[in-house]
Amino acid sequence: LRKVAHLTGKSNSRSMPLEWEDTYGIVLLSGVKYKKGGLVINETGLYFVYSKVYFRGQSCNNLPLSHKVYMRNSKYPQDLVMMEGKMMSYCTTGQMWARSSYLGAVFNLTSADHLYVNVSELSLVNFEESQTFFGLYKL
Amino acid sequence: LRKVAHLTGKSNSRSMPLEWEDTYGIVLLSGVKYKKGGLVINETGLYFVYSKVYFRGQSCNNLPLSHKVYMRNSKYPQDLVMMEGKMMSYCTTGQMWARSSYLGAVFNLTSADHLYVNVSELSLVNFEESQTFFGLYKL
Amino acid sequence: LRKVAHLTGKSNSRSMPLEWEDTYGIVLLSGVKYKKGGLVINETGLYFVYSKVYFRGQSCNNLPLSHKVYMRNSKYPQDLVMMEGKMMSYCTTGQMWARSSYLGAVFNLTSADHLYVNVSELSLVNFEESQTFFGLYKL
């Protein structure tokens, strides 16, 4: 079976890393486990990993935004940032605003690697399933 | 044969969903049909679907922009929005502006699904083949 | 072996096309050669090609930004722009700013094709490995 995941935004996320909807809607989860916000790799190999986050706010104050996909493995002491997007000075002060960040690339992942998504400002994330998501597939 | 498509912007299009160049240039279409703006799936399975739209204008008024990839199937009464990007308050009033929206993710598609791209304002789309495109491939 | 590459930003790039880190960090290079900024295809076929560039500056002057993935082959006299992103009027004058451009799509590539990334303003690119990268894999 193809190892694949597509998880969508979960609006009751209250902490980092982001948590994801892994059951309902346009979700996919096959040959990969989901655990506390993370996708857990169970077979070493090459994977295309992607994420999109939709940020929006009622009144722009240009708070710096970041969106990271990072990896954690018990063998390593520190998280490894695989992909990252940052935004600064992106909207007109006081206006309602909206913007997305998209990341996607190929990585060599090892069994037991845990992949997560982090954002700098949770209150500015909109969790609609079509707008904010996290996925991967084994090549 | 690998099921794959890469369609590029078609500039004399006035209709929604967007219409695409399916013959000339850097276009690919193999094992998937193109019909009236849509990519028609003929084999159930996992697909990576992507689209990029290039918006630009002579004088910024921050018209809200949206870019959607959606799916239609005669078995379902309503379109399903698979991926979406929105932009608000993204340029300086009165200035010439340009911005792209990129979407890409994995979906489980069924034979006879039709995939389309929609934008909120067609007049602001630039259809250069390198800038605006729509594609997929079967994993 | 799977033909795959993921190259990351190299901060001593001084000219176009961009040069890339092909040895250290989260780099992948298998079944594809790297030569003077370019990924060299050695087997004809379908490839998913992607790139992300992270632009940032101390004081916004809205210099137009472009990010291109292009192809060169000795059989053709001219470069072919495969994908391109442009940004104009994207930040507030005088402010510190940051923005990313992401490109990714499927192409039919031929043995001896050379793929490169070009940007309009090298001094505004940040080369962190998680932020600026270039990759592909054979479907």
């Epitope: - | 500039s11 004399n12 299009s13 006035r14 018209l63 809200p64 909120s120 304002e121 067609l122 007049s123 | -």
Partner: antibody, heavy 119, light 111 residues
Framework: QVQLVQSGAEVKKPGSSVKVSCKAS????????ISWVRQAPGQGLEWMGW????????QYNENFKGRVTLTTDKSTSTAYMELSSLRSEDTAVYFC????????????WGQGTLVTVSS | EIVMTQSPATLSVSPGERATLSCRAS??????????IHWYQQKPGQAPRLLIY???HLESGIPARFSGSGSGTEFTLTISSLQSEDFAVYYC?????????FGQGTKVEIK
């Protein structure tokens, strides 16, 4: 900057036709609709139809179907509105307006052309 | 066709005061994304000028004292503090379907 410049005032006999021109500049003519709106003396605004210069497609208000014809000349970035079988109630100022395709708001207007229908 | 009804027909306001103009559509002009209603200002002998688009978005170059709100069938144009140059006729227009139709207009005059 975007400009729409219309042809001058016309006086026409009942039963005849009138053709008003609208020359566009300052933007890509083939990417936006041109709509035509008329305003009878002391009255409100009435939308007549739109044309898309990109492919020449058009749509008309049923109230004018069969009497109005919208055309464009891409080489000169000019739109035309021809109204036939004129009657006295067609006396009005006729405006062309640039219209965004999807949002269909009229963001730039011509100065207007007064058409008087009188015997 | 969608009928647009504006009220009042005439609004008498003193300079510096707030003006509130209403526009009602005979059926909803909103989708999940946008409300397809636009507001224009017209002065005697001039073409209309776009003020507000998609119910609440200020057109570039229009002063911030103009604002729009509403969804579905009920919409409002507000001028927070009337200036002398704001005395004019105001029209709402929908673009939800064909034909595009305008309201009959509200004349804002000096009290």
């Amino acid at each position: 900057q975007v400009q729409l410049v219309q042809s001058g005032a016309e006086v026409k006999k009942p039963g005849s036709s009138v053709k008003v021109s609208c020359k566009a500049s300052g933007y890509t003519f083939t990417r936006f609709d041109i709509s035509w709106v008329r305003q009878a003396p002391g009255q409100g605004l009435e939308w007549m139809g739109w044309i898309f210069p990109g492919d020449g497609s058009s749509q008309y208000n049923e109230n004018f179907k069969g009497r109005v014809t919208l055309t464009t000349d891409k080489s000169t970035s000019t739109a035309y509105m021809e109204l036939s079988s004129l009657r006295s109630e067609d006396t009005a100022v006729y405006f062309c307006a640039r219209s965004l395709i999807s949002t269909a708001m009229f963001d730039h207007w011509g100065q207007g052309t007064l058409v008087t229908v009188s015997s | 066709e969608i009928v647009m009804t504006q009220s009042p027909a005439t609004l008498s306001v003193s300079p510096g005061e707030r003006a509130t103009l209403s526009c009602r559509a005979s059926k909803s002009v909103s989708t999940s994304d946008f409300s397809y209603i636009h507001w224009y200002q017209q002065k005697p002998g001039q073409a209309p000028r776009l003020l507000i688009y998609l119910a609440s978005h200020l057109e570039s170059g229009i002063p911030a004292r103009f604002s729009g709100s509403g969804s579905g069938t009920e919409f409002t144009l507000t001028i927070s503090s009337l200036q002398s140059e704001d005395f004019a006729v105001y029209y709402c227009q929908h673009s939800r379907e064909l034909p595009r139709t305008f309201g009959q207009g509200t004349k804002v005059e000096i009290k």
